[in-house]
C-alpha cells in the first residue's frame, strides 16, 4: 500500500532589506501567466545565490507570495506584480505561504523501529 502525500501549509511574514542588486529572487504567476493550475497567485521560482533573500534564508522556491508591504497580490497581471516588487522600496515586507510536503505512511503501518510495537 502506498503512502499518501499531504501538504502542511504555513504562513510567515518575511522582512527583507533590498541588497545592492535588489531582492534576489524571481517570480512566476499572475492572471495572464498561471503557472499553477487554477491559481493565478505569485510564486517564487528562483532564489539568487548570495542575494538578499538567500542571505535571509527564509524565502524558498515554491513559496506563494500573498502580499508585499501589505498590498495583496491577488488578481494581478504578471508584469504588475514584477513592478510592485521592483518599486517596493528599501525595506520590503512579504507575507508568504510555505507548502511543505509531508509523506504519510499507510494506515495501520508501523515502522520497523517503532517503539510502540
Amino acid at each position: 500500500m502506498n503512502g499518501r502525500v499531504d501538504y502542511l501549509v504555513t504562513e510567515e511574514e518575511i522582512n527583507l532589506t533590498r541588497g545592492p542588486s535588489g531582492l534576489g529572487f524571481n517570480i512566476v504567476g499572475g492572471t495572464d501567466q498561471q503557472y499553477v493550475s487554477n491559481d493565478s497567485g505569485i510564486y517564487v521560482s528562483r532564489i539568487k545565490e548570495n542575494g538578499a533573500a538567500a542571505l535571509d534564508g527564509r524565502l524558498q522556491e515554491g513559496d506563494k507570495i500573498l502580499s508585499v508591504n501589505g498590498q495583496d497580490l491577488k488578481n494581478l497581471l504578471h508584469q504588475d506584480a514584477v513592478d510592485l516588487f521592483r518599486n517596493a522600496g528599501y525595506a520590503v515586507s512579504l507575507r508568504v505561504q510555505h507548502r511543505l510536503q509531508v509523506q504519510n505512511g499507510p494506515i495501520g503501518h508501523r515502522g520497523e523501529g517503532d517503539p510502540s510495537g
Epitope: 534576489g24 501567466q33 528562483r46 539568487k48 516588487f85 521592483r86
Partner: nanobody, 127 residues
C-alpha cells in the same frame, strides 16, 4: 530544463548589421526570462539585453542602447538579437541565456549569476 542553441554570428564590417537567433527546447519557454550576454577574449561575460516572458518588457546595457533590439517569438520558442551600427568593440562570443520566472530586480543590475541555462555561444567579429 531548457536547451539553447544560438546562430547568426559571423564576420561583418563596422556599421553593418547582424541578427542572432536562439532556439530553445522546452515546454514552458514562455515562462522564462531570456537574455543575451557577450564575452570578449580575456574579459568577463557581460550583460547585453534581456526580454520578459511575453516580450512586454526589455532591458539593455548602456553600450548597446539604441543599436541592439531584443525580441522573442514564443510560438517558435526563439529569441532574437538584432544588432545594428556594429562597432569593432562589439566583437565577442554572444551567449543566449534563460532563467525561470521574472527577476524582481531591475535589469540595471543583471549579471551572469541571474541566469541558469546557457547556449554554447556564437562568434561575432566586427572589422
Amino acid at each position: 530544463d531548457v536547451q539553447l542553441v544560438e546562430s547568426g554570428g559571423g564576420l561583418v564590417q563596422a556599421g553593418g548589421s547582424l541578427r542572432l537567433s536562439c532556439a530553445a527546447s522546452g515546454r514552458t519557454f514562455s515562462s522564462y526570462t531570456m537574455g543575451w550576454f557577450r564575452q570578449a577574449p580575456g574579459l568577463e561575460r557581460d550583460f547585453v539585453a534581456e526580454i520578459s516572458w511575453n516580450g512586454g518588457s526589455t532591458g539593455y546595457a548602456d553600450s548597446v542602447k539604441g543599436r541592439f533590439t531584443i525580441s522573442r517569438d514564443n510560438a517558435k520558442n526563439t529569441v532574437y538579437l538584432q544588432m545594428n551600427s556594429l562597432k569593432p568593440q562589439d566583437t565577442a562570443v554572444y551567449y543566449c541565456a534563460a532563467v525561470i520566472g521574472s527577476p524582481t530586480d531591475s535589469s540595471d543590475y543583471r549579471s551572469s549569476l541571474d541566469y541558469d541555462y546557457w547556449g554554447q555561444g556564437t562568434q561575432v567579429t566586427v572589422s
